[in-house]
Structure formats: structure tokens, C-alpha cells
């Protein structure tokens, strides 16, 4: 049953004399293992014998014996799957049909494979893409229908006989589907490669030439152009003539149109290979090129820079930067169209020439207010001197200058006055927009730069103002020098340090905290009377009569201030003691008599002692001595003694007469 045998292998294999052939092959015999294998060369079936006739290149039998002459041919297969063969070396007369006679226990099969062996190594085949364009990467393929493990080969690429620098990728295939060696080369052709010969060379392992294939490159490219100009340096003066010629050095395919461009813009009605410019002007300066197109696209020549020389045009000034801050650096640039470039410059500030400034740029490292103004320049080249342009304005900005705080009031200023101050300045750029004042207060600013201090205080000392634009400039503080009456007038006891006792030396000081002006007068007052005009009031020996309410006054040209009343207290021992008797110094017995100890003392008497005519102290210690009922025996002289913290005082004797009552007399 033939359907049981399935073979896979290349249909035809190619080789050359002396090389080798490797035949990849697989099979499947479903009824069992292979028992016999014979490799025929050009086998023919003999109907008589029912066997195949032909040269037997290889034979394997059940006992596994192989004749020695069969070493050139090797069966590399097995009994059920692999039927790979190798012939090494292979000869020209091996060409033809190889027959693989396979026998299993019950089945037989003849498989045919074509072998093509040439006398010499056959050439590889170069495959090119259908179209090649300049600068577009293409892959060149060199294919050879040969590969054999026992015969290594290599494929090399050459361009015009010179090995190509680009790295090629070589791959081989030895499979049941295909047998080949392939080299692929990635390549970006340039227009200059058009018409050049590319070769793929087959070499043996030693690099010996075996065969090759060649192709001529057809590289499609835009027209390649050369531009020529008269005069050759393309430098002319206004009024001269210029001729430019465009030559096509290569184009594939042929060109179709011609045009000229200036600074990238097409020139109208210029469609020939020659461009004639008559009586050129400076506006015709620029970059010229010709453009020629074909089906691939437009090609452009190199640019020719036509320079039409002319004297400098009126100049303009560029300032970096205006407005400028005082103290910063500023650069001025003189801009003037000229060809050739100006070699010399003249600079002007406010119409006056700036000496020693001949460069295109003027650099001022430290700008001052006087640098402000109009800057202009004149440029000069070999063809002449330009005109001075309108110039540029430099604005120099700076903080307000010479700021002063000015008191508008007539002097002197008195406490309580309304003081008006103005903040003045000499100059400012930009304009002053606001003012600041130190110290801060709840003060009125009736107009910009004017400060009104209502009811100025005695202690308002100095005021400073700042005029502000983008910056603030402070003036030196101005002293208000406010005049005021003496302040905080008070009476202070200097001596004695402790309480005042009668007879002490006493000094009172009239103090005040401040006065402006400083020249003052003093007045001492007691109960509306003037006592003295010195700062001190002195008592050599104080008496109780000096006690009372004292004030001192301090007077300057602004006003007079009085102290609060100060009470002077004099301490003294009891004095002017006397004993008074009530109802009188003669009292009838049986009645009531009251003796009172009267005195003058500071502090008041704290303790009284009573004495009789015998200087005998009586057991009574209050101010009043009450005798009730009075007896005749009470008649006699009495005196009292008063005591306070300062001392004692005694009264003179006072006589009490107690007379008998009528009843007593009657009884007698």
C-alpha cells in the first residue's frame, strides 16, 4: 500500500564537481521499521525481473554490511524517520536521478530525488528591489541554491570591484523544504552610485574565487547641479552686472523644468540655464541657486551669496536696556545696513560727539543720571559714510535725590501747635508717587508730601521723611525742638530725712522733669503768699507756726506750672499747757468740779498725768479730772503733764478753792 510511505526532501539539489551534496530527507513507513535501503543512480524498473536496475551508490542490508567503495556516499538516516544522505565529494557524473529504494517487512518504495552537478561552481543570483532611489535604504540579496556541511563557502559584495563597507548578513538553509546560502546587504545608495556595478562573489573557505553575479545600479535621483557666477567671488557694487549659469551634472530620469531662486523664493520668468542680472541694486543681494526638476523631484544647486556692496544706510541705535537703573550697565548698539560691514562708527550723545567711541557697541559700566538723553551714531565703510538716524532715548531711573524734611511753621514751635512739614527733593526718575514718615503717627497728610501734626506733643523730637518712586530715599531727621512749659513740678523734702520736729533745719526742693526753654524761675507759695524765688526753700529752725500747705511754681517763657499743694507738718512736744476749771476755780462743797488739761501738741497728747499741790501724782490719766462730790479738802493748787511721742510738757499751778456749803456753816 503505497500510501503508507511519506517522504519530504528538496525536489532538486544543486552542486558542482568536487563539492558535496547534503540531502535533507524524512520518511514514514507505517508498517514497521526499515529493513533494507539501496541508493540507485538513475534507476530503471525491470519488468522482467520486477526489480530496479542502475548504479548502486549505497546499499544497506539486514546484516548491516556496506561495501567499502560506498564511503563517498553516506546514509545518515535511521530505520523509521530520517533518510538524510551525504555525497562527498560529488562528481559531474552524479547528475541525474537518485533513487531511494526502501523495504520494510511487507512494503517496498522507490523515492526519486533530482541531482544537478555542474562542471564549475555556478553563479549566485543578485536580487534588487524594483526601484532604487537615492538616500533610501534598500536590501540587496545574493542567493545561491547550494549549501553543504562538508564544503564551506562565502558570499562577498563588491562595488566597482571594491569590497563594500556595509556589513552583510549571511544565512544558510539545509532543510527538507529548501537548501540555499543567502547574503543580504542593507545599503543607502547615493546619486553617485547610479550606473555602478555591484558584484556578489562566491568564494571557498580560503577566499578563493568560485563564481559571481553582477548588476548595474539604476539609482533614481533628482538633478545634480553646479552653479557658476561671473564675477567668481559674487561681490559687486551697485550698478554692476552679474551672470549665473546652471549646469546639470547628473539626472535620473531626465530633467523636465528649470527655475531660479533668491533667498528661497522663486524668481519669476527665469526658466533658462542662465540668469543675467543687469545694473544690480543692494536689494538684489542674497543667496541664489538654480532648481532643476525631474520625476523624482527638484534638485537645487549650492547657493551663491551675491553681495552688492553699498555705503552704510541711516543708522539706528538699540539700547540694552532702557529704562536703566542708576549704577547698572548699559550697552548701545549701532545698527546700519552696509556692505561691507562698517569699519568705523561715530557716536553722539544729545547731538554732541562722544570722544573715543569708534566701535559698533558702546558699553557704559555704571550709568549715572547725566547719561540720560538721545544717543545716535554714524557708520562708515570703504564706500562712504552713512547718515545719522533718529537715535534712541536712554531713560535713567534713580531714587529721589537730596531729600529734605522742611518745617513750614514759624519757629519756635510750641506744645499744642499744629506743625506742617513738607518733604522736598531735588530730582527723581520716575516721578515721586508716595511719601513715608518716621516715626509713624495718627497724623494727617493733607496733600502729597505734606504732613500735618495737630496739637504737637512736648515730646515730639525728630521727624524724617522719605520720597518714594520705585525706591525710597530718606531725609536726615529734622528736630522739631518743641517748646513747652515746665513739666511734672513737685515739692520734695530734702532734709531732714525723717519726720520734721520743731527746731529742725528743713529744706524743700522744687523739682520738675523738663522744660524747654531751659531758663526757669521759681516761686514758693504758702497760703497765697510769696515766700521765695529760689529752687529751694530753707528753714534754719522750723517752728510749729511754719506748718501748712506749700506750693512751688516753675516759670519759663512758654508758661508757668504749679506743683500740687504739699503739706508741711511740724512735730513738737506738748506746749502751752494750762489747767482750766469748770464751773470755775471756786466751787461749793458737794458740787461737781472738772479740771481740764489743755495743751498744744503734734502729735496730740497721748498720755496725761495729774499732780496736786504736793506734787503728788493723782491716779487719773485722762485729759479731764472730775471731782464729784467735791470736798473742802480738795482745795489746793493742781497742775498737769501732757506726753506725746516727741516729749512732755507741764502746766503752771492752778488753784481750786472749795468752800463750805450753808448747811455745813449752819451746823457749825
Amino acid at each position: 500500500d503505497s500510501s503508507k510511505w511519506v517522504f519530504e526532501h528538496p525536489e532538486t539539489l544543486y552542486a558542482w564537481e568536487g563539492a558535496c551534496v547534503w540531502i535533507p530527507c524524512t520518511y514514514r513507513a507505517l508498517d514497521g521499521d526499515l529493513e533494507s535501503f539501496i541508493l540507485f543512480h538513475n534507476p530503471e524498473y525491470n519488468k522482467n525481473t520486477s526489480k530496479f536496475d542502475g548504479t548502486r551508490l549505497y546499499e544497506s542490508t539486514k546484516d548491516g554490511k556496506v561495501p567499502s567503495e560506498q564511503k563517498r556516499v553516506q546514509f545518515l538516516g535511521d530505520k523509521n524517520k530520517n533518510c538524510t544522505l551525504s555525497i562527498h565529494p560529488v562528481h559531474l557524473n552524479d547528475s541525474g536521478q537518485l533513487g531511494l529504494r526502501m523495504e520494510s517487512k511487507t512494503e517496498k518504495w522507490m523515492e526519486r530525488i533530482h541531482l544537478n552537478v555542474s562542471e564549475r561552481p555556478f553563479p549566485p543570483h543578485i536580487q534588487l528591489p524594483p526601484e532604487i532611489q537615492e538616500s533610501q535604504e534598500v536590501t540587496l540579496t545574493c542567493l545561491l541554491n547550494f549549501s553543504c556541511y562538508g564544503y564551506p563557502i562565502q558570499l562577498q559584495w563588491l562595488l566597482e570591484g571594491v569590497p563594500m563597507r556595509q556589513a552583510a548578513v549571511t544565512s544558510t538553509s539545509l532543510t527538507i523544504k529548501s537548501v540555499f546560502t543567502r547574503s543580504e546587504l542593507k545599503f543607502s545608495p547615493q546619486w553617485s552610485h547610479h550606473g555602478k556595478i555591484v558584484t556578489c562573489q562566491l568564494q571557498d573557505a580560503d577566499g578563493k574565487f568560485l563564481s559571481n553575479d553582477t548588476v548595474q545600479l539604476n539609482v533614481k535621483h533628482t538633478p545634480k547641479l553646479e552653479i557658476k557666477v561671473t564675477p567668481s567671488d559674487a561681490i559687486v557694487r551697485e550698478g554692476d552686472s552679474v551672470t549665473m549659469t546652471c549646469e546639470v551634472s547628473s539626472s535620473n530620469p531626465e530633467y523636465t523644468t528649470v527655475s531660479w531662486l533668491k533667498d528661497g523664493t522663486s524668481l519669476k520668468k527665469q526658466n533658462t540655464f542662465t540668469l543675467n542680472l543687469r545694473e544690480v541694486t543692494k536689494d538684489q543681494s542674497g543667496k541664489y541657486c538654480c532648481q532643476v526638476s525631474n520625476d523624482v523631484g527638484p534638485g537645487r544647486s549650492e547657493e551663491v551669496f551675491l553681495q552688492v556692496q553699498y555705503a552704510p544706510e541711516p543708522s539706528t541705535v538699540q539700547i540694552l536696556h532702557s529704562p536703566a537703573v542708576e549704577g547698572s550697565q548699559v550697552e548701545f548698539l549701532c545698527m546700519s545696513l552696509a556692505n561691507p560691514l562698517p569699519t568705523n562708527y561715530t557716536w553722539y550723545h544729545n547731538g554732541k560727539e562722544m570722544q573715543g567711541r569708534t566701535e559698533e557697541k558702546v558699553h557704559i559700566p555704571k550709568i549715572l543720571p547725566w547719561h540720560a538723553g538721545t544717543y545716535s551714531c554714524v557708520a562708515e565703510n570703504i564706500l562712504g559714510t552713512g547718515q545719522r538716524g533718529p537715535g534712541a532715548e536712554l531713560d535713567v531711573q534713580y531714587p529721589p535725590k537730596k531729600v529734605t524734611t522742611v518745617i513750614q511753621n514759624p519757629m519756635p514751635i510750641r506744645e499744642g501747635d499744629t506743625v506742617t512739614l513738607s518733604c522736598n527733593y531735588n530730582s527723581s526718575n520716575p516721578s515721586v508717587t508716595r511719601y513715608e514718615w518716621k516715626p509713624h503717627g495718627a497724623w494727617e497728610e493733607p496733600s502729597l508730601g505734606v504732613l500735618k501734626i495737630q496739637n504737637v506733643g512736648w515730646d515730639n523730637t525728630t521727624i524724617a521723611c522719605a520720597a518714594c518712586n520705585s525706591w525710597c530715599s530718606w531725609a536726615s531727621p529734622v528736630a522739631l525742638n518743641v517748646q513747652y512749659a515746665p513739666r511734672d513740678v513737685r515739692v520734695r523734702k530734702i532734709k531732714p530725712l525723717s519726720e520734721i520736729h520743731s527746731g529742725n533745719s528743713v529744706s524743700l526742693q522744687c523739682d520738675f522733669s523738663s522744660s524747654h526753654p531751659k531758663e526757669v524761675q521759681f516761686f514758693w507759695e504758702k497760703n497765697g503768699r510769696l515766700l521765695g524765688k529760689e529752687s529751694q526753700l530753707n528753714f534754719d529752725s522750723i517752728s510749729p507756726e511754719d506748718a501748712g500747705s506749700y506750693s512751688c511754681w516753675v516759670n519759663n517763657s512758654i508758661g508757668q506750672t504749679a506743683s500740687k499743694a504739699w503739706t508741711l507738718e511740724v512735730l513738737y512736744a506738748p506746749r502751752r499747757l494750762r489747767v482750766s476749771m469748770s464751773p470755775g476755780d471756786q466751787v461749793m462743797e458737794g458740787k461737781s468740779a472738772t479740771l481740764t488739761c489743755e495743751s498744744d501738741a503734734n502729735p496730740p497728747v497721748s498720755h496725761y498725768t495729774w499732780f496736786d499741790w504736793n506734787n503728788q501724782s493723782l491716779p487719773y490719766h485722762s485729759q479731764k479730772l472730775r471731782l464729784e462730790p467735791v470736798k473742802v479738802q480738795h482745795s489746793g493748787a493742781y497742775w498737769c503733764q501732757g506726753t506725746n511721742s516727741v516729749g512732755k510738757g507741764r502746766s503752771p499751778l492752778s488753784t481750786l478753792t472749795v468752800y463750805y456749803s450753808p448747811e455745813t456753816i449752819g451746823r457749825r
Epitope: P486, Q521, L530, W553, I558, Q560, T561, A562
Partner: nanobody, 122 residues
Framework: QVQLQESGPGLVKPSQTLSLTCTVS??????????WNWFRQPPGKGLEWMGA???????TYSPSFESRTSISRDTSKNQFSLKLSSVTAADTAVYYC??????????????RGQGTLVTVSS
């Protein structure tokens, strides 16, 4: 305790004469060595001394006011008075009377009146 009290019209027309009286209690204006002063404080300005009358009755005036000021007294009522002629708006002020040693504007409350505002306006 000495007390002083000013009295008079609060509004005076320009070119007229301003008249104010100061009544004193707690002290006699004829005894001692005090001066009895008139002074004023215009809005936004400091104290200005105008003139005074002594216990003896003699008067003294500030040079700024001498030409149009007159100070007199009524000892029976223990009062002294101020007359200021030809007034203008600039004479608008708080007017004070006060006692002092020597002529001076008095700055302490216990020796001056509370003050009376006089406005000069038509």
C-alpha cells in the same frame, strides 16, 4: 482751694469786641503777690499769653495783643475781665484765666479755669 471760672459769649462777630470775665473763689484778687492772667489756645496752636493784672491793680500786656487788649477788675465781686477789640476769625480760640507768680500762661489745672470757646464768625 482756689477756683477760677471764665464766662462770656461763645460767638462774636468780626470787628466787634470780645468781653470775658473770670470769677475767682478761694482767694482774693487784691491780696498776696499773684498775677491774674488771660491766655488763649487757638485750634492747632500752643498757649498764647495775652496779659495780666497784679494784686496791686497794675496791668501788663503781651506785645502781640497790647494794641487791642484791656484787662480790668471788680474787687467787690472778686472778678477780673478781658476786652479784645476788632476781632477776626484768627481770634477764634479757647480762652483761659489763671493765677500765677509773675506773668505767664498757666499750665496746671488747679490754677486756671476750664476755658471757654469763643468763635468769631458772622
Amino acid at each position: 482751694q482756689v477756683q477760677l471760672q471764665e464766662s462770656g459769649p461763645g460767638l462774636v462777630k468780626p470787628s466787634q469786641t470780645l468781653s470775658l470775665t473770670c470769677t475767682v473763689s478761694g482767694a482774693s484778687i487784691t491780696t498776696g503777690e499773684f498775677y491774674w492772667n488771660w491766655f488763649r489756645q487757638p485750634p492747632g496752636k500752643g498757649l498764647e499769653w495775652m496779659g495780666a493784672i497784679a494784686a496791686s491793680g497794675s496791668t501788663t500786656y503781651s506785645p502781640s495783643f497790647e494794641s487791642r487788649t484791656s484787662i480790668s477788675r471788680d474787687t467787690s465781686k472778686n472778678q477780673f475781665s478781658l476786652k479784645l477789640s476788632s476781632v477776626t476769625a484768627a481770634d477764634t480760640a479757647v480762652y483761659y484765666c489763671g493765677r500765677s507768680f509773675g506773668v505767664a500762661a498757666v499750665t496746671t489745672g488747679q490754677n486756671r479755669g476750664q476755658g471757654t470757646l469763643v468763635t468769631v464768625s458772622s
